[in-house]
Structure formats: structure tokens, C-alpha cells
């Protein structure tokens, strides 16, 4: 199984997401995104940024699911 | 109008399955979220888990490994189907609509009335 | 997970008159708190969310607010009809749901 990083905050997250962002990121940062492992303790979605950054969020903002509809359909 | 209704939830015994399901009208499944909540009798509200607009199940902590929620959009309908159950699944089940007007798709403006269950031999 | 408190069972106050209930959480959820009504034998009601936007065609007697960990929620003016549960619930991190307060309307 897999074992949950040591990452405690919404940045940079090797493994799962602990806490998400409170803040919305703006769509033309955003470059990929991905889910975390379906055994993480708490579902996430992954942004990662034009700089290279990754981001905790989640899944439930209405804002996260608007992004991953507009990257899905680009 | 626009309304959720669960199906009939009943007596189960412990280690049944349950499944549940959702029939929503008025609105599309494509324009929001559906959450399922439970409450045990005398307690409060607990989350299970919800699936998106674009159909993408999450759960919570304790629900995901023995909970499965899908839809069908052609039937507008959502269903939640839990494994092992024990007596303390005895609850009533609620799904409830969630529109991201709020910003968040947890925050729920139509609920139906809720189901039954009762797990006990 | 975000645990929330809420002010112990039951609020008692007259007709017309004020109630406060609060609902602690256990770490910082930003103003990510929703409030619901629930009567027996019904389904919660949504009252607020974003702690102090009132959800529509809620009274304005229904009042939200704080942020952080503490908040609260006022009921001026109150109506027999205001006799219900009320739960907060934290849409930040857990989606979790305060234990409810029971309010009583003499």
C-alpha cells in the first residue's frame, strides 16, 4: 500500500493531499493537474503550475472542477 | 420544481449490502453535485461522499473503502451502494443536491426526506 | 479531521427574542462554514454558507458570522417556527458537521 507523504501543507505534495488551498489559482498559471492515490486518507486534486509548483486542492471547490472541465476540453 | 428522492431503505442484516438511490427531477445531473448524507437516530449529520457533475466519485475517510457511488444520467438517477454493514449504519440516508452556487459543492440547497435503514440480526 | 463544537442542548428563549449558537472548529477553516436547520422527521435546511451569506429566501433574522475558528449564528425576532436543530458544517477540509443545538421557543 501505498504510505502517505510527509508533506503537511496544500504545496508541494509528493503523495497525498493533508490540506488544500484556500485560494483560488488563476486558470492561465495552471499547466496540468492530477488526482492523488485513491488511498490517500482525503481525496485531491494536484495543480501544478507554469513554475513548476503543485498544489493541493479540493476536489469539492466549484472552481477546481471548472478548471478540470476546461483542461479536459483542451 | 426541483426535488431528490431516495429509494426505500428497510431492515438489513449485519454484513448485507445496502444500495440506495437517488432520483432527481427538475434539473440535470450535469448542473451539480449529489451528496449522500446519513444520520444515525438521536445523532448528527454525517458525510459519506458525493459525485461530481462530470461523474467523478469521492468519498470520505471512513465510507471509500466500502462505498461506491455512480450515477446514470439517462435515468437521473444516483446510487450509493455500501458493503458490510453493521449496526452502526443504522441511520437515515439522505442525498442532497449540491449547485456550486455556493462556491463548494458540499454545501447542499435540496435534500429529500431521507430513508430508513436498519442493520440488525 | 476539523472537529466542530457546537453550544451544548438546549437554547431556550422567548418569542421575540434572541438566540446565539456557536460552533467551534478544531483548526482554522478559513470562512468555510455552512449553517442548516433541521426539524424532526425533516431533512436540514440550508440557512447560510460562506459563515454569513444567507441562502435563499432565508429571513434576515438569521444572522452568520465569524471566521477562523470561532462563529456564530443569531436568530432575532424569534418565532415559534424556529424551533429546530441547527448544525454547522465546515466545507474546507473534511466536510464535517457539528454535533447540532437544540433550540427551544417558549
Known amino acids: 500500500t501505498k504510505t502517505e507523504s510527509s508533506s503537511r501543507g496544500p504545496y508541494h505534495p509528493s503523495e497525498c493531499c493533508f490540506t488544500y488551498t484556500t485560494y483560488k489559482i488563476p486558470r492561465q498559471r495552471i499547466m496540468d493537474y492530477y488526482e492523488t492515490n485513491s488511498q490517500c486518507s482525503k481525496p485531491g486534486i494536484v495543480f501544478i503550475t507554469k513554475r513548476g509548483h503543485s498544489v493541493c486542492t479540493n476536489p469539492s471547490d466549484k472552481w477546481v472542477q471548472d478548471y478540470i472541465k476546461d483542461m479536459k476540453e483542451n | 420544481c426541483q426535488s431528490v428522492k431516495e429509494s426505500e431503505g428497510g431492515l438489513f442484516k449485519p454484513t448485507d449490502t445496502l444500495t440506495l438511490t437517488c432520483t432527481v427531477s427538475?434539473?440535470?445531473?450535469?448542473?451539480?453535485?449529489i451528496n449522500w448524507v446519513r444520520q444515525a437516530p438521536g445523532e448528527g449529520l454525517q458525510y459519506i461522499g458525493w459525485?461530481?457533475?462530470?461523474?467523478?466519485?469521492y468519498y470520505a475517510s471512513w465510507a471509500k473503502s466500502r462505498s461506491t457511488i455512480t450515477r446514470n444520467t439517462n435515468e437521473n438517477t444516483v446510487t450509493l451502494k455500501m458493503t458490510s454493514l453493521t449496526a452502526a449504519d443504522t441511520a437515515t440516508y439522505f442525498c442532497?443536491?449540491?449547485?456550486?452556487?455556493?462556491?463548494?459543492?458540499?454545501?447542499?440547497?435540496?435534500w429529500g426526506q431521507g430513508t430508513l435503514v436498519t442493520v440488525s440480526s | 479531521a476539523v472537529v466542530l463544537t457546537q453550544t451544548a442542548s438546549p437554547v431556550s428563549a422567548p418569542v421575540g427574542g434572541t438566540v446565539t449558537i456557536n460552533c467551534q472548529a478544531s483548526?482554522?477553516?478559513?470562512?468555510?462554514l455552512a449553517w442548516y436547520q433541521q426539524k424532526p422527521g425533516q431533512p436540514p435546511k440550508l440557512l447560510i454558507y460562506?459563515?454569513?451569506t444567507l441562502a435563499s429566501g432565508v429571513p434576515s433574522r438569521f444572522k452568520g458570522s465569524g471566521s477562523g475558528t470561532e462563529f456564530t449564528l443569531t436568530i432575532s425576532d424569534l418565532e415559534c417556527a424556529d424551533a429546530a436543530t441547527y448544525s454547522c458544517?465546515?466545507?474546507?477540509?473534511?466536510?464535517?458537521f457539528g454535533g447540532g443545538t437544540e433550540v427551544v421557543v417558549k
Open positions: 459525485i461530481s457533475d462530470v461523474g467523478s466519485a
Open positions: 460562506g459563515a454569513s
Open positions: 427538475g434539473f440535470s445531473l450535469y448542473s451539480g453535485a
Open positions: 458544517q465546515e466545507y474546507l477540509s473534511d466536510n464535517t
Open positions: 442532497a443536491r449540491g449547485d456550486g452556487s455556493s462556491g463548494n459543492y458540499w454545501v447542499t440547497d435540496i
Open positions: 483548526e482554522s477553516i478559513s470562512s468555510r
